[in-house]
């Protein structure tokens, strides 16, 4: 007869660990007892438990409430246990030695690893700003049994680095993504990928990319200056500008308050009916959190009136 | 290598005994039990029982009362028997070695197709 | 009762694509699990058993996986030669029951 068992045993922590030995044997053969033992080098054999083909299963006090067979239907060859809930404590050695009459005793060894899945953790970097150079986009940290492998999926350009820490039982894994910031990586995914064995299928942590910038700031409305005269109804400027936080916007007249009736709703500028006292100097000014922006145009209002009035090249800054 | 021959009747009587002769080669009895599955008509595969490589029997419990599964292993047979059949045991009959894992079944025989009709 | 689900009940699939197939059991079966393969008029076939070893001469393209209540067939790069019909089956407690079956026809 021979001893069937498996020579490595892997178990996710928390789960319950199938450790096989079955004897296949000739019919008339009796198998008495399987005896299971954890074998440690420092503390020798441990005693886990007992079947009696008579008696039933017997468990050591260590392994109470830990240790049972499989139920019925059972090969009356079939020598397996179950240790319930396994933990990293009980990774090592296991011997099944199977007496059997009239061939005597045959014995086998298996290891038993206990998969600790990781738990990743995403921590962003610093705020990123354009017009930084190489700086970090974020971390991820994934500690498990055996090491875990942590990877990024992006369509951004980056560079990735890993360190990896040993713990006794453990390996921690932390691979950081490194990028130099630019305003179209704004919203953009960058996941964090954990590969592990004792995961079904790898864990994703997404972080979406936030770039903070501001656009230089350009005046729309003033594109053809004839349109500019006296009487004219619902002319407006508009305050051109991108930014990441979203900016504000503001108005003001360089040379006096801005004239009464001439409204400001964001980044607009609503005059009345044109009048000759609408003519000036208006700057646009835009500011977020990171910086500000200002741009002025020159307003000239035509009088049909007054024809020896000539139109003035609009210039903008 | 490892063959199971399966002879047995196409047609029961309601009421009649089933018995299938499932004989094999390229293997031991005395090494691999043997189990016995059907399928009936458009359904799936249902599990009947096992005998194991020592002699020794489980049976599927809607089935204990009226089956029996023995062997001769000299003769490298295992022997099927169901007694009082009716219409919805109309089936394809399989006999199957048991696996390397104690378990599982890694060769089927042909399959016997039963009509139970009168 | 004891009950093992298996999904979907049928599927369809091109040559070269991935599929997976699923079983769900009622309780904890400790891998005790085997996947079997089924071509129309024929015997079925073993594919896995313990829930992740492969049956000899099974090609690698075939993969089992999972533990406790959920486990999966996998197979990559669909062949002409894997459309049928696939069972699971579980070894824990009487009666040994299979899942009701995914029939995998070519697209």
């Known amino acids: 007869g021979e001893l069937e068992t498996s020579d490595l045993v892997t178990v996710v922590l928390g789960q319950d660990a199938k450790l096989p030995c079955f004897y296949r044997g000739d019919p008339d053969e009796q198998v008495g007892q399987v005896a299971w033992a954890r074998v440690d080098p420092n503390e020798g054999t441990r005693e886990l438990a007992l079947l009696h083909s008579k008696y039933g299963l017997h468990v050591s006090p260590a392994y109470e409430d830990r240790v049972e067979q499989p139920p019925p239907p059972r090969d009356p060859l079939d020598g397996s246990i179950l240790l319930r809930n396994a933990v990293q404590a009980d990774e090592g050695e296991y011997e099944c030695r199977v007496s059997t009459f009239p061939a005597g005793s045959f014995q086998a060894r298996m290891r038993l690893r206990v998969l600790v899945p990781p738990l990743p953790s995403l921590n962003p970097g610093p705020p990123l700003e354009e017009g930084q150079g190489l700086t970090l986009a974020a971390s991820c940290t994934a500690e498990g049994s055996p090491a875990p492998s942590v990877t990024w999926d992006t369509e951004v350009k980056g560079t990735q680095s890993s360190r990896s820490f040993k713990h006794s039982r453990s390996a921690a894994v932390t691979s950081e993504f490194h990028l130099v910031p630019s305003r179209s990586m704004n919203g953009q995914p960058l996941t964090c990928v954990v590969s592990h064995p004792g995961l079904l299928q790898d864990q994703r942590i997404t972080h979406t990319l936030q770039v903070a910038f501001l656009a230089e700031a350009s005046v729309r409305g003033l594109e053809d200056q004839n349109l500019w005269h006296v009487g004219r109804e619902g002319a407006t400027l508009k305050c051109l500008s991108e930014g990441q936080p979203p900016p504000k916007y503001n108005w003001t007249r360089l040379d006096g308050p801005l004239p009464s009736g001439v409204r400001v709703k964001g980044d607009t500028l609503g005059f009345p009916p044109l009048t000759t006292e609408h003519s000036g100097v208006y700057v646009c000014h835009v500011s977020n959190e990171l910086s500000s922006r200002a741009s002025q145009v020159t307003v000239e209002v035509l009088d049909p009136e007054d024809p020896g009035k000539q139109v003035d090249l609009v210039s903008a800054s | 290598q490892v063959q199971l021959k399966q002879s047995g009747p196409n047609l029961v009587q309601p009421s009649q005994s089933l018995s299938i002769t499932c004989t094999v080669s390229?293997?031991?009895?005395?090494?691999?039990?043997a189990h016995w599955v059907r399928q009936s008509p458009g359904k799936g595969l249902e599990w009947l029982g096992v005998?194991?490589?020592?002699?020794?029997?489980d049976y599927n419990a809607a089935f204990m009362s009226r089956l029996s599964i023995t062997k001769d292993n000299s003769k490298s047979q295992v022997f099927f028997k169901m007694n009082s059949l009716q219409a919805d045991d109309t089936a394809i009959y399989y006999c199957a070695k048991i696996g390397y894992d104690g378990y599982a079944m890694d060769n089927w025989g042909q399959g016997t197709s039963v009509t139970v009709s009168s | 009762d004891f009950q093992v689900t298996q999904s979907p009940a049928s599927l369809s699939a091109s040559v070269g694509e991935t599929v997976t197939i699923t079983c769900r059991t009622s309780e904890n079966i400790h891998n005790y699990l085997a996947w079997y393969q089924q071509k129309q008029g024929k015997s079925p076939q073993l594919l896995v058993y313990?829930?992740?070893t492969l049956a000899d001469g099974v090609p690698s393209r075939f993969s089992g996986s999972g533990s406790g209540t959920q486990y999966s067939l996998k197979i990559n790069s669909l062949q002409p030669e894997d459309f049928g019909t696939y069972y699971c089956q579980h070894f824990w407690s009487s009666p040994w029951t299979f899942g009701g079956g995914t029939k995998l026809e070519i697209k």
């Open positions: 390229g293997f031991s009895l005395t090494t691999y039990g």
């Open positions: 005998i194991w490589r020592g002699g020794s029997t």
């Open positions: 313990n829930a992740k």
